[in-house]
């Protein structure tokens, strides 16, 4: 609910068009889950790094660019 | 059962300012977003602003920057909409609701009894 | 901002008749919109959110549907405690908006 991923191909599909919803794994849950584009009311949601809506739930969730981590993608990865 | 209390009907001189409370029971107050909506008379809903517990701060329509202070006291679980330099297009119904969501605002899902201020000379 | 438009603005049916309401975004706001409905002197509803979900509690004569600008409410069987204005509202970007609201009256 709002954990972050990582970028690299393992973490699956992310969302190409705006509106359409995709299946994803994320590499912290191991679960599926379906993603649209996030609301734009969250588009300085994540500091670095990229959100998607994870649907069911009706929250945000962030995709870190490498060397990031934190919910929000908001701390530098020490161990990068 | 999540319950909003808002405070009584106002009645304001033009160029004053009114307050208006909203008191939340029954769930957890700082985890949510509080909105404010208002009805003109006979009219359809406007939101005003809302606190984005995820900014951590309130957001305001453009139509009311600068005229409207959105705030929330977690202390007494109570938000508060104050609206100053009033005028005769003011008078309506304000409504506190309660976004569904813990980050932003989504769904309205609980409300307020609704608080109507008369702005009258 | 992000306009809503309804419609009708308002319309008049029978018990038992089937009831649709439409809303259009002026943007594509995916499926990020929800219904409400309100009666004279009461606060509003929620009914429907994120186009097709229904809240807990609300009746499963309601449905909603539609995506990117374009949706839909309906009421499959018009009930007596159905009269009422109809709004939705979207929660893509800020300023939230509503749109004008659909009176449905008794015929």
């Known amino acids: 609910d709002g954990n972050s991923t990582r970028s690299p191909e393992t973490n699956g599909l992310l969302c190409g068009d705006p509106d359409e919803n995709c299946a994803a794994t994320t590499t912290q849950s191991k679960r599926k889950g379906h993603f649209s584009r996030c609301p734009k009311q969250y588009k300085h949601y994540c500091i670095k790094g990229r959100c998607r809506f994870v649907v069911t739930e009706q929250t945000p969730s962030c995709v870190c660019d490498e060397g990031y981590i934190g919910a929000r993608c908001e701390r530098v990865d020490l161990f990068y | 059962q999540v319950q909003l209390v808002q405070s009584g009907a106002e009645v304001k001189k033009p160029g004053s300012s009114v307050k208006v409370s909203c008191k939340a029971s029954?769930?957890?107050?700082?985890?949510?977003?509080i909105s404010w909506v208002r009805q003109a008379p006979g009219q359809g809903l406007e939101w005003m602003g809302g606190i984005v517990p995820w900014m951590g701060e309130a957001v305001y329509a453009q139509k009311f920057q600068g005229r409207v202070t959105i705030t929330a006291d977690e202390s007494t679980s109570t938000a508060y909409m104050e609206l100053s330099s009033l005028r005769s297009e003011d008078t309506a119904v304000y409504y506190c609701?309660?976004?569904?969501?813990?980050?932003?605002?989504?769904?309205?899902?609980?409300w307020g009894q609704g608080t109507l201020v008369t702005v009258s000379s | 901002d992000i306009q809503m438009t309804q419609s009708p603005s308002s319309l008049s049916a029978s018990v038992g008749d089937r009831v649709t309401i439409t809303c259009r975004a002026s943007q594509s706001i995916s499926n990020f919109l929800n219904w409400y409905q309100q009666k004279p002197g009461k606060a509003p509803k929620l009914l429907i959110y994120?186009?097709?979900n229904l809240q807990s509690g609300v009746p499963s004569r309601f449905s909603g549907s539609g995506s990117g600008t374009d949706f839909t409410l309906t009421i499959s069987s018009l009930q007596p405690e159905d009269f009422a204005t109809y709004y939705c509202q979207q929660y893509d970007d800020f300023p939230m908006t509503f749109g004008q609201g659909t009176k449905v009256e008794i015929k």
């Open positions: 994120a186009a097709s």
């Open positions: 029954g769930g957890t107050f700082s985890s949510y977003a």
């Open positions: 609701a309660r976004s569904s969501s813990t980050y932003g605002i989504h769904a309205f899902d609980y």
